[in-house]
């Protein structure tokens, strides 16, 4: 079941849905570019991707601080109950923009831009990233991540923008967490009902990659729930 | 019209502080990365600090770095820079702008900023 507003945007946003997106980026004064296609179900809340480093590979930081910039951020592919207005959905034709903070543990941060249009029925994302600070013996720099647990963002509406809060953690090869505390406003491109506080509920998993992590597949399931919901639909 | 309105300025010892702030109007303000430029009799007007659209992004001159803090109230359509640790170098007229288009990242030219304000004049003395 969708809502009204969702129910006018479904010729817009269709039951399946391509992007494309190519991010620039630095990290640590590494410049990179990646480029990458992916597809889902926006009203299903599950979308894949491929990812390819085009300029700048085998990058020198673990690609887990750049996987949630494609698909954290490709948020049309939430799946959303008909009593939350699903705000970056009905942004569309139009579309959205983005931008994030990523405070790292250890010092090291990640600011993040981007914008999503639609184009010939596709969605396109245009990304770029910063990182700087990241300690050359950190779990980054050594490469040393294994992946990010799932995760709750907690969206509220705030100064004609959507804003989201996660406390993620990703995994550590010696089984430890490596935390981030992470910062997102979402802002439509056109005037757009708010929707009140809720959660989404996040998982991304890599499932494919390389050996340098030059080509790297990712999947995504993300579920937004009023704020009492739990996280084990994500597991199933 | 767009309209940028700074104020904040003064006279102020070496080690003191001041917060300037920059009123607009005439545009979406949330919509656009704002910039604080500087000039000192003789010199040319250089960069101080930026914030992006949802003050997420922050940029510093190296100068300034540790001492300024650039912030931005949506609501008011205000942007600030809390200066700190003042030196005599930084004695100028400090202007904001607001960046031409709402992708700014990290750009600090003036060439990336459309629209300016008048300026406030900031002494420091010794």
């Known amino acids: 079941m969708v809502s009204k507003g969702e129910e006018d945007n479904m010729a817009i946003i269709k039951e399946f849905m391509r992007f494309k997106v190519h991010m620039e980026g630095s990290v640590n004064g590494h410049e990179f570019e990646i480029e990458g296609e992916g597809e889902g179900r926006p009203y299903e809340g599950t979308q894949t991707a491929k990812l390819k480093v085009t300029k700048g590979g085998p990058l020198p930081f673990a690609w887990d601080i750049l996987s949630p910039q494609f698909m954290y951020g490709s948020k049309a592919y939430v799946k959303h109950p008909a009593d939350i207005p699903d705000y970056l959905k009905l942004s569309f034709p139009e579309g959205f923009k983005w931008e994030r903070v990523m405070n790292f543990e250890d010092g090291g941060v990640v600011t993040v831009t981007q914008d999503s249009s639609l184009q010939d029925g596709e969605f396109i994302y245009k990304v770029k990233l910063r990182g700087t600070n990241f300690p050359s013996d950190g779990p980054v720099m050594q490469k040393k991540t294994m992946g990010w647990e799932a995760s709750s963002e907690r969206m509220y509406p705030e100064d004609g923008a959507l804003k989201g809060e996660i406390k993620q953690r990703l995994k550590l090869k010696d089984g430890g967490h490596y935390d981030a505390e992470v910062k997102t406003t979402y802002k439509a491109k056109k005037p757009v009902q708010l929707p009140g506080a809720y959660n989404v509920n996040i998982k991304l998993d890599i499932t494919s990659h390389n050996e340098d992590y030059t080509i790297v597949e990712q999947y995504e399931r993300a579920e937004g729930r009023h704020s009492t919901g739990g996280m084990d639909e994500l597991y199933k | 019209q767009v309209q940028l309105v700074e104020s904040g300025g003064g006279l102020v010892q070496a080690g003191g502080s001041l917060r300037l702030s920059c009123a607009t109007s005439?545009?979406?303000?949330?919509?656009?990365?704002m910039g604080w430029f500087r000039q000192a009799p003789g010199k040319e007007r250089e960069f101080v600090a930026a914030i992006s659209w949802s003050g997420h992004v922050t940029d510093y001159a190296d100068s300034v770095k540790g001492r300024f803090t650039i912030s931005r109230d949506n609501v008011k359509n205000t942007v600030y820079l809390q200066m700190n640790s003042l030196k005599p170098e930084d004695t100028a007229v400090y202007s904001c702008?607001?960046?031409?288009?709402?992708?700014?990242?990290?750009?600090?030219?003036?060439?990336?900023?459309?629209?300016w304000g008048q300026g406030t004049q900031v002494t420091v003395s010794k």
């Open positions: 005439g545009f979406t303000f949330s919509d656009y990365a």
């Open positions: 702008a607001a960046a031409k288009s709402g992708t700014w990242w990290y750009q600090r030219s003036e060439n990336d900023f459309g629209s």
